[in-house]
């Protein structure tokens, strides 16, 4: 653990109620294939514990979806995965729509310091998939 | 070799018959820019042969393929990604449908132990493209 | 640095004129989340300093997009990652058409030697965001 | 602890409009939408829309745009439905409801308010 | 819209039985589905959510199952207390759509 290998792997535990964009995340062997080693959750939301450059990557699907339901609606759903705190650090690290499409994934390197709390809004009515192997968001410390 | 580093990025090879959906692959420098190292294939599929936490990622394009031709099947096109040997251990990784795409990319965090086998399961009718810019399956041991 | 874990992250910086199809990009901590470690710009096209095994990764969003617009287009928009000088060692790593998308994201294994030039070719008239959450392209050393 | 509490029932004639009103106690009213959903006499459920009570966007179900309006007063930690051009038809309890952690999941209740249209 | 199709309409049951209520919902709802009880003269009060998630002070009598289509609420033991209209709801999606309700009485 002493080399910094910071890595997690979360699955959707819930949406937040409907003001909050929010997906709430859970990760831990007795739940599945998901786990944290290093980064840990507060409040369904990773925090990161060791600074760094990261590879974060996600994929998000879409429960109830087909090409025009994702089109049909007049608000395009988003997803965005950011810093949401310390408030001075918020950005937003990456950003995908889905366009007649019900699932996005990519990923990217970024930095991240001990204490940034990274969040994934999605924004729109439609609710993401909870199957483990259709949506889930991870982090991976790759140097310092 | 010791620190663990396996790594493996494959090409396709061919796809099954009509009732196998597994992707077949190969690998090795005089096929082009494929290759394993640590992996090995076993008649086509990816055998993990260190235990430990890797990077899994894919993409698989549809050789003939417009925006249509994805969405008037009446099934759609999926990928899935999954461990289907030694049956105690068979699970689904990943998965993506084409909803009006003709590519699917993703990659995620997932514990794997020697001997566990990867299957890429592509359903539907469509065919993936053998171009190795368009279709390549990979995977990356990231720590123990 | 000795370790070898040269890496990257790059924003897009302009596209060029008509006629030539590579992305310029960008990096440095001055212009926010991208970052340079080991690899270098040459006339915003990013060449390895380190031979190895890399992860490469890319997302692109289309500027002003919808389903639409990337349909109606005859000559579709592509996205192609590749080798592009020295000219011995030409070739295209990673390929993916927007097909009713406005964003592609993909990630690949590839050796990649010292003083390859990597280009990102995108063809078509649509243009990419420059957000730098929607826009980005970077490598990582992975193994020798 | 959290607490909506909708104004009495009302009787009215057809073309009247009424405005049933649902304060709220024992959160921030911002933090949360708040939904509204009928229920005419011995039938089931109906979600009618919510309102964004930071925003104040309202959403409608269809059936429900037009003579239905939701409101709010912030600072009274207050939602309103408005019905106009009543009709015999939209007879029914209306009940404001709210989530707690998950989407669409409805925790709080209001007490319900029974609209009676008839002439 | 999500059509869902709740039955029976009507049962009744004896204090100590085992009660079962079916959903079924016009397409997948990927577990997105939850149960309320009303009393007569009462607001509605949530059972069940994500279909099988007990709420916070419910007894463990009560339990849902399901998955895609098909969901099920069930109460192990009637009690006296339990008498009321029980709806599904399923929450995937925009227009929230309800269940007709089944209303539970004693025998």
């Known amino acids: 653990e002493s080399l910094g290998w910071d890595i997690a792997e979360l699955q959707l535990n819930h949406t937040g109620p409907q003001q909050d964009p929010r997906l709430y995340w859970q990760g831990g062997p007795a739940l599945g294939r998901s786990f944290l080693r290093g980064p840990e959750l507060d409040k369904g939301q990773l925090r990161i514990r060791r600074d760094g450059i990261y590879m974060v990557h996600i994929q998000v699907t879409l429960a109830i979806c087909s090409s025009t339901s994702t089109s049909r609606h007049h608000h395009p759903t988003t997803l965005a995965v950011g810093i949401c705190s310390p408030a001075s650090r918020s950005i937003s690290l990456l950003r995908l729509s889905f366009h007649q499409g019900c699932t996005i994934a990519s990923q990217r390197l970024t930095p991240l310091a001990r204490g940034d709390t990274l969040c994934t809004n999605l924004t729109g009515t439609l609710l993401p998939s909870r199957n483990t192997d259709e949506t889930f968001f991870g982090v991976q410390w790759v140097r310092p | 070799e010791s620190l663990g580093w396996d790594i493996a990025e494959l090409q396709l090879n061919h796809t099954g018959p009509q009732q196998d959906p597994r992707l077949y692959w190969q690998g090795g420098p005089a096929l082009g820019r494929s290759f394993l190292r640590g992996p090995e294939l076993d008649k086509g599929q990816l055998r993990i042969r260190r235990d430990g936490i890797y990077m899994v990622h894919i993409q698989v394009t549809l050789a003939i393929c417009s925006s249509t031709s994805t969405s008037r099947h009446h099934h759609p096109t999926t990928l899935a990604v999954g461990i289907c040997s030694p049956a105690s251990r068979s699970i689904s990784l990943l998965r993506l449908s084409f909803h009006q795409g003709c590519t699917i990319a993703s990659q995620r965090l997932t514990p794997l132990a020697r001997g566990d086998t990867l299957c890429t399961n592509l359903t539907g009718t469509l065919l993936p493209s053998r171009n190795t810019d368009e279709t390549f399956f990979g995977v990356q041991w990231v720590r123990p | 640095e000795s370790l070898g874990w040269d890496i990257a992250e790059l924003q897009l910086n302009h596209t060029g004129p008509q006629q030539d199809p590579r992305l310029y990009w960008q990096g440095g901590p001055a212009l926010g989340r991208s970052f340079l470690r080991g690899p270098e710009l040459d006339k915003g096209q990013l060449r390895i300093r380190r031979d190895g095994i890399y992860m490469v990764h890319i997302q692109v969003t289309l500027a002003i997009c919808s389903s639409t617009s990337t349909s109606r287009h005859h000559h579709p928009t592509t996205l192609a990652v590749g080798i592009c000088s020295p000219a011995s060692r030409s070739i295209s790593l990673l390929r993916l058409s927007f097909h009713q998308g406005c964003t592609i994201a993909s990630q690949r294994l590839t050796p990649l030697a010292r003083g390859d030039t990597l280009c990102t070719n995108l063809t078509g008239t649509l243009l990419p965001s420059r957000n730098t959450d929607e826009t980005f392209f970077g490598v990582q050393w992975v193994r020798p | 602890q959290v607490q909506l509490v909708q104004s009495g029932s009302e009787l009215k004639k057809p073309g009247a409009s009424v405005k049933v009103s649902c304060k709220a106690s024992?959160?921030?009213?911002?933090?949360?939408?708040m939904n509204w959903v009928r229920q005419a006499p011995g039938q089931g459920l109906e979600w009618m829309g919510w309102?964004?009570?930071?925003?104040?966007?309202?959403t409608y179900a269809d059936g429900f745009t037009g003579r239905f309006v939701f409101s709010l007063d912030t600072s009274a930690s207050t939602a309103y439905l408005q019905i106009s051009s009543l009709k015999a038809e939209d007879t029914a309890v209306y009940y404001c409801?709210?989530?707690?952690?998950?989407?669409?999941?409805?925790?709080?209740w209001g007490q319900g308010t029974l609209v009676t249209v008839s002439s | 819209d999500i059509q869902m199709t709740q039955s029976p309409s009507s049962l009744s049951a004896s204090v100590g039985d085992r009660v079962t209520i079916t959903c079924q919902a016009s397409?997948?709802?990927?577990?997105?589905l939850n149960w309320y009880q009303q009393k007569p003269g009462k607001a509605p009060k949530l059972l069940i959510y994500d279909t099988s998630r007990l709420h916070a002070g419910v007894p463990s009598r009560f339990s849902g199952s399901g998955s895609g289509t098909d969901y099920t609420f069930t109460i192990s033991s009637l009690q006296p207390e339990d008498i009321a209209t029980y709806f599904c709801?399923?929450?995937?999606?925009?227009?929230?759509?309800f269940g007709q309700g089944t209303k539970l009485e004693i025998k």
């Open positions: 709801q399923q929450g995937v999606t925009l227009p929230l759509t």
């Open positions: 024992g959160y921030t009213f911002t933090n949360y939408g």
């Open positions: 409801a709210r989530e707690e952690d998950y989407r669409y999941v409805f925790n709080y």
């Open positions: 397409q997948d709802i990927s577990n997105y």
């Open positions: 309102i964004n009570t930071y925003t104040g966007e309202p």
